[in-house]
């Protein structure tokens, strides 16, 4: 009885939360009742353990099929690329912290932080990103430098919509800059790295959005923000990207307590976007001008503009005013990349996947960790893979393109029976000399069945040994391109599938 | 056992303050939406107020809006109701309840109510 | 504010009888109705929710039925601890309203 009526009442929630949909309700009343929703088919989950255990990934998680990883691995491959073509040092770190090292530093996403059960000694969280571990990794082995790279899981407790390539455990790519460096010159690096591999993965076009935390906080100021207000007012400006400026003013108005011709301020600002003459007109503005904060930020932006022009990247930049992303610890510089259209097929839906990367700059963070408050200038970018990885799936899975999932170069296959030793000994020899080489786990394969394996496998290359073949020395060597065979001498079959499968010469 | 017991009441002036607590005990406390019922002596029962298991979420009714605030401490497994200016009509016996199934406004556990009466 | 009409007011019956209780919402609740049961000095006590399901521990006389704006709860066959005040409720949106009550009592 209690089950039924728990599906009863998901039943009746879930049209509760359409209809509020449908009467166009404010955000944050469906966000209520979603929440409700969540919650109720948490428990009919957990009701529904008590009779049958269900057999599925956490909420938020996923597995990832062969097919899946094979996507993900060439995407990382172009990240680790760029990365490392920019000269950068890789490093690891804990996948959780000590809760301390996590605490105050995201704000209002700080909610979203999994803590982990007391195991009776230290306070533990699992990171909720990569960049506070390094700032974390930085003060505590006292360095003044670094440029690394960082590629690793990172854990939210988000409702995430997972069509949307959102998660509760997601990969984070980070790239940052720490220490003492000429202004804008690294921040302009970062720009041109995430917009090296934005290009490079071909996902579509995007733009990226600059903006800056002392633009943000002289513009708060001037428009008569009081100071305990800036950041719960900063993540009301950051939704304008979703919502109507309409929306935010109310949510400013009538949640936090603003006053409306202050909110009417701000949306001057914050409606404008545009590229360094933007720049120029606010360094012009009356009341910014005014202000030494947002005039040190817009000299910034400026300087950094004229790198970018260098870089040849200025066309995908836009300074946006509305920009003013979530965490706390940024001080100053603040990007953020956006698709501005998804590679769609006639009559799909565009895939709505929001940001794609961002970052910018924490002269700040390190400081939190150090005894003695030594701060050390960082600046870095985020790559949204999980975002990514689901736009080139859609991608893939509308091409009905075939994707490898496995390196094999070739298969060893015999055409009678009796021939498994001579498979193990030539597949062992291909081995050692460093070529990636499979065979069926069978004494006696039917011909027919080892080809069919190697086409759907995708496998370029299939070795035939034959009784014949083997009293004559060679082996039948057969293109799943072409379609041609050639017998090839056993002692040149090794440099035979290297010139076909463009491998040079490499051992294990 | 599962039980809520409120506390708090008493006589109070007309435009005075009072603040009422709820001590939960038995279940997950922060699992669960609370709520502030009343019941005016010989009548029928009204809905106050509510509060999220997170704290996110507050209502209050049109009579209370602006004079009373309800909030919770998880920590302390305790719900609290910080009624000021209180008028004469605010005098009743205060329920805190329980969201039944964590989230649906139906109170499925209740405390045994604490008197509050306005009065000069 | 979404009003709730019970009927009747009072009803008066004698043990073994069946009982029927009506409410009525002003406007279209699908099926966000509770029923409480409340004694003199006691808190109300959940019966139904969801208009019709029953409250775990409610002896299943009590039964619920009804969607929109007329819902009805049932007592089968009364017994002596069930003559009390009987309360509706619509949980569909704030504020929640209650039915002004209605009173069972010994025939």
């Known amino acids: 009885a209690d089950r039924a009526a728990l599906e009863e009442l998901v039943r009746l929630q879930g049209a509760h939360v359409r209809g509020l949909k449908e009467q166009k309700a404010s955000a944050e009343q469906i966000e209520e009742e979603v929440t409700k929703l969540l919650k109720l088919k948490a428990q009919l989950g957990q009701d529904e353990g008590k009779q049958k255990f269900v057999l599925k990934t956490p909420k938020g998680t996923r597995d990832y099929s062969p097919r899946q990883m094979a996507v993900r691995e060439k995407v990382f491959d172009v990240i680790i690329r760029c990365f490392k073509r920019h000269g950068a040092e890789v490093i690891d770190t804990p996948v959780f912290e000590l809760k301390e090292t996590l605490t105050g530093k995201y704000g209002e996403d700080s909610k979203l932080i999994y803590d982990l059960k007391d195991q009776g000694g230290e306070l533990l969280s699992l990171r909720y990103d990569l960049t506070v571990p390094f700032a974390r990794y930085l003060a505590m082995n006292k360095l003044t430098n670094i440029k690394r790279y960082h590629i690793a899981k990172v854990y939210r407790r988000d409702n995430p919509a997972m069509t949307r390539g959102r998660y509760r455990e997601f990969y984070q790519c980070d790239f940052d800059i720490a220490g003492q460096f000429d202004p804008m010159i690294p921040d302009a690096e970062c720009l041109k790295i995430m917009c090296e591999i934005l290009s490079s993965l071909q996902i579509g076009n995007f733009l990226v959005k600059v903006n800056d935390r002392r633009i943000l906080d002289g513009m708060f100021a001037v428009c008569g923000v009081p100071d305990s207000k800036f950041r719960t007012i900063c993540s009301s400006v950051d939704k304008l990207d979703k919502v109507s400026w309409e929306e935010v003013k109310n949510e400013m108005v009538g949640e936090k307590g603003l006053a409306p011709e202050v909110a009417d301020r701000i949306g001057d600002y914050v409606q404008q976007h545009g590229g360094v003459s933007l720049v120029e007109q606010l360094l012009q503005d009356p009341k910014l001008s005014q202000n030494k904060q947002a005039v040190e930020g817009l000299g910034d932006l400026k300087l950094l503009f004229e790198y970018l022009i260098l870089f040849g990247i200025d066309d995908k930049i836009s300074f946006d005013l509305s920009l003013a992303r979530g965490l706390d610890y940024y001080t100053g510089v603040i990007y953020e990349a956006v698709l501005l259209q998804m590679p769609t097929q006639a009559g799909e839906e565009p895939l709505g996947v929001g940001s794609i990367a961002a970052g910018g700059r924490y002269d700040g963070l390190v400081g939190m960790f150090d005894p003695k408050g030594r701060k050390v200038p960082c600046v870095g970018l985020s790559i949204g893979v999980e975002r990514i990885f689901s736009i080139v799936e859609q991608r893939l899975e509308a091409s009905e393109e075939k994707v490898r999932t496995t390196e094999t170069q070739v298969l060893v296959a015999s055409a009678q029976k009796k021939l498994l030793e001579e498979r193990l000994k030539l597949v062992s020899e291909l081995w050692d000399a460093g070529i990636k080489a499979e065979l069926l786990y069978k004494k006696n394969p039917k011909l027919l069945n080892q080809l069919q394996y190697w086409e759907e496998a995708g496998i370029p290359l299939v070795a035939i040994i034959g009784e014949q073949e083997l009293r004559d020395g060679v082996i039948k060597l057969r293109s799943v391109a072409s379609r041609e065979e050639v017998d090839v001498r056993r002692e040149d079959l090794v440099e035979e599938i290297r010139r076909r499968t463009n491998q040079p010469l490499s051992t294990c | 056992q599962v039980q809520l017991v409120e506390s708090g009441g008493g006589l109070v002036k007309p435009g005075g303050s009072l603040r009422l607590s709820c001590a939960a005990s038995g279940f997950t406390f922060s699992d669960y939406y609370m709520t502030w019922i009343r019941q005016a002596p010989g009548k029928g029962l009204e809905w106050v107020s509510y509060i999220s298991g997170s704290f996110r979420y507050t209502n209050y009714a049109d009579k209370v809006k602006g004079r009373f605030t309800i909030s919770r401490d998880n920590a302390k497994n305790s719900l609290y109701l910080q009624m000021n200016s209180l008028r004469d009509e605010d005098t009743a016996v205060y329920f805190c309840?329980?969201?039944?199934?964590?989230?649906?406004?139906?109170?499925?556990?209740w405390g045994q109510g604490t008197l509050v009466t306005v009065s000069s | 504010d979404i009003q709730m009409t019970q009927s009747p007011s009072s009803v008066s019956a004698s043990v073994g009888d069946r009982v029927t209780i009506t409410c009525r919402a002003s406007q279209g609740i699908s099926s966000w109705l509770a029923w409480y049961q409340q004694k003199p000095g006691r808190a109300p006590k959940l019966l139904i929710f969801?208009?019709?399901s029953l409250q775990s521990g409610v002896p299943s006389r009590f039964s619920g039925s009804g969607s929109g704006t007329h819902f009805t709860l049932t007592i089968s066959s009364l017994q002596p601890e069930d003559f009390a005040t009987y309360y509706c409720?619509?949980?569909?949106?704030?504020?929640?309203?209650f039915g002004q009550g209605t009173k069972l009592e010994i025939k």
């Open positions: 309840a329980r969201y039944v199934y964590q989230v649906v406004a139906i109170g499925d556990l």
């Open positions: 969801a208009a019709s």
């Open positions: 409720q619509q949980a569909e949106s704030f504020p929640y309203t």
